[in-house]
Interface confidence: low
Amino acid sequence: SERCDDWGLDTMRQIQVFEDEPARIKCPLFEHFLKFNYSTAHSAGLTLIWYWTRQDRDLEEPINFRLPENRISKEKDVLWFRPTLLNDTGNYTCMLRNTTYCSKVAFPLEVVQKDSCFNSPMKLPVHKLYIEYGIQRITCPNVDGYFPSSVKPTITWYMGCYKIQNFNNVIPEGMNLSFLIALISNNGNYTCVVTYPENGRTFHLTRTLTVKVVGSPKNAVPPVIHSPNDHVVYEKEPGEELLIPCTVYFSFLMDSRNEVWWTIDGKKPDDITIDVTINESISHSRTEDETRTQILSIKKVTSEDLKRSYVCHARSAKGEVAKAAKVKQKVPAPRYTVELACGFGAT
């Protein structure tokens, strides 16, 4: 059959691997596009075919599986490099087919170089640790399947350029790195280097991740509205500009959505006819606590506007709060000729 269901170039999975290291890449068809796995496909008589397009070339070509020492091989639904070379960079396609069925997807593979301090163009995963929270661990990622459980690799951990030893609150424990009490000073890039033997050769796997120390849930509080508050009154004359800031502090909460909004007479500003603009700014502390400021602005306020209720609302996973701004119309200063003169009994 000429027909082949082509899922295009799957850039959602931008695969990056280090030069001169083993890499195992699973065909994305079974992980993201098809509802059956490789074993089911294989037992149904379907064949998995691999080919690739070199960087800056349009020509699809077969993958050479006859290189010395089986440098590139295929095992079930996995394409193996032992090890990678810089010019392996390109778009790889896996195609599942028989005489009546065909499905394929391409994905980009980038082989990147690293320096002696593990710096590289590699996109790094971020692992968040709670500040002063007790023992927390990070695990050397993406090393499953490279060697059998009978092989005992050696693992070395680095922070930046430095091998981790005699760090007072960070302890290497094989594949894990334990933080006894995470501190801001623990922010940084951590690298595990896994070394293992295979068929008389020694391979290295390098994995780097970024640790970010964030606010602890035990210190988290509901949103705190700093402004508006009871101490500030927004007193304006008709025609003046009314500016009311709503400033809210949010504790860091993993996966929490922080929201701030204004209501005017109980309605969202979009739902009323007055000419109001709202500008938002966001700042973060070093532990990713967040301060959001929304400034409500009415360019030329009317006496009607000054009678309205202006309420700032805030919500996070910890709760919802609201605070009304104190808005009033400024009483005009008395004009001497009439008001004061009358006050002194003049006629």
Epitope: C4, D5, G8, L9, D10, F36
Partner: antibody, heavy 118, light 107 residues
Framework: EVQLLESGGGLVQPGGSLRLSCAAS????????MSWVRQAPGKGLEWVSA????????LYADSVKGRFTISRDNSKNTLYLQMNSLRAEDTAVYYC???????????WGQGTLVTVSS | EIVMTQSPATLSVSPGERATLSCRAS??????LAWYQQKPGQAPRLLIY???TRATGIPARFSGSGSGTEFTLTISSLQSEDFAVYYC?????????FGQGTKVEIK
């Protein structure tokens, strides 16, 4: 003659559900990947979802992921789009289109209007 | 995702004149680009696929060119039925994306 005919559109409240259908004629649906593409009033085209010719592979735009489900019944030569938790921003004309990797969206239906409003 | 940018937003042309529409991709889409024509109240119609191949039944006055990130749709001599909105679309990378459209109107 290849024809695609959408149905099932209408007015629905936010949070509600609708199921769109696309009946194919003039070709065998099972031979092609199919897609839904939408167009908000006065706006451009936005790809929504795709399904492989055997129904085993599905893809969704981030804007509808988790809310919309694409499916097909090849025996009825019909494509479906189940839309749940509808939002005002889902208001659009929804087109079904036949997709082939080398010829893109080569045939389109006439579209069905979905209006999400309270 | 790949962003497709079309220019100009509106093109005013007299019947019989040549119209040139541009489409730019934020990263290379090889030659996996299509052009569609849409008239008010109608569904889009495929004009060009593979950047330069005319779809079945499309008149020879429509031609496409380009590859990588820069693409052009040319209508050599505009007929009255050609006044419409034209969209480009890449189908190289998931998710598939469209340009915002170019309206070709009568001058």
């Amino acid at each position: 003659e290849v024809q695609l005919l959408e149905s099932g559109g209408g007015l629905v409240q936010p949070g509600g559900s609708l199921r769109l259908s696309c009946a194919a004629s003039g070709f065998t649906l099972s031979g092609f990947s199919m897609s839904w593409v939408r167009q908000a009033p006065g706006k451009g085209l936005e790809w929504v979802s795709a399904i492989s010719y055997d129904g085993e592979g599905t893809l969704y735009a981030d804007s509808v992921k988790g809310r919309f489900t694409i499916s097909r019944d090849n025996s009825k030569n019909t494509l479906y789009l189940q839309m749940n938790s509808l939002r005002a921003e889902d208001t659009a004309v929804y087109y079904c289109a036949r997709f082939r990797y080398y010829t893109a969206f080569d045939y389109w239906g006439q579209g069905t209007l979905v209006t999400v409003s309270s | 995702e790949i962003v497709m940018t079309q220019s100009p937003a509106t093109l005013s042309v007299s019947p019989g004149e040549r119209a040139t529409l541009s489409c730019r991709a934020s990263q290379s889409v090889s030659s996996n680009l299509a052009w569609y024509q849409q008239k008010p109240g109608q569904a889009p119609r495929l004009l060009i696929y593979g950047a330069s191949t005319r779809a079945t039944g499309i008149p020879a006055r429509f031609s496409g060119s380009g590859s990588g990130t820069e693409f052009t749709l040319t209508i050599s001599s505009l007929q009255s039925e050609d006044f419409a909105v034209y969209y480009c679309q890449q189908y190289n990378n998931w998710p598939w994306t469209f340009g915002q459209g170019t309206k070709v109107e009568i001058k």
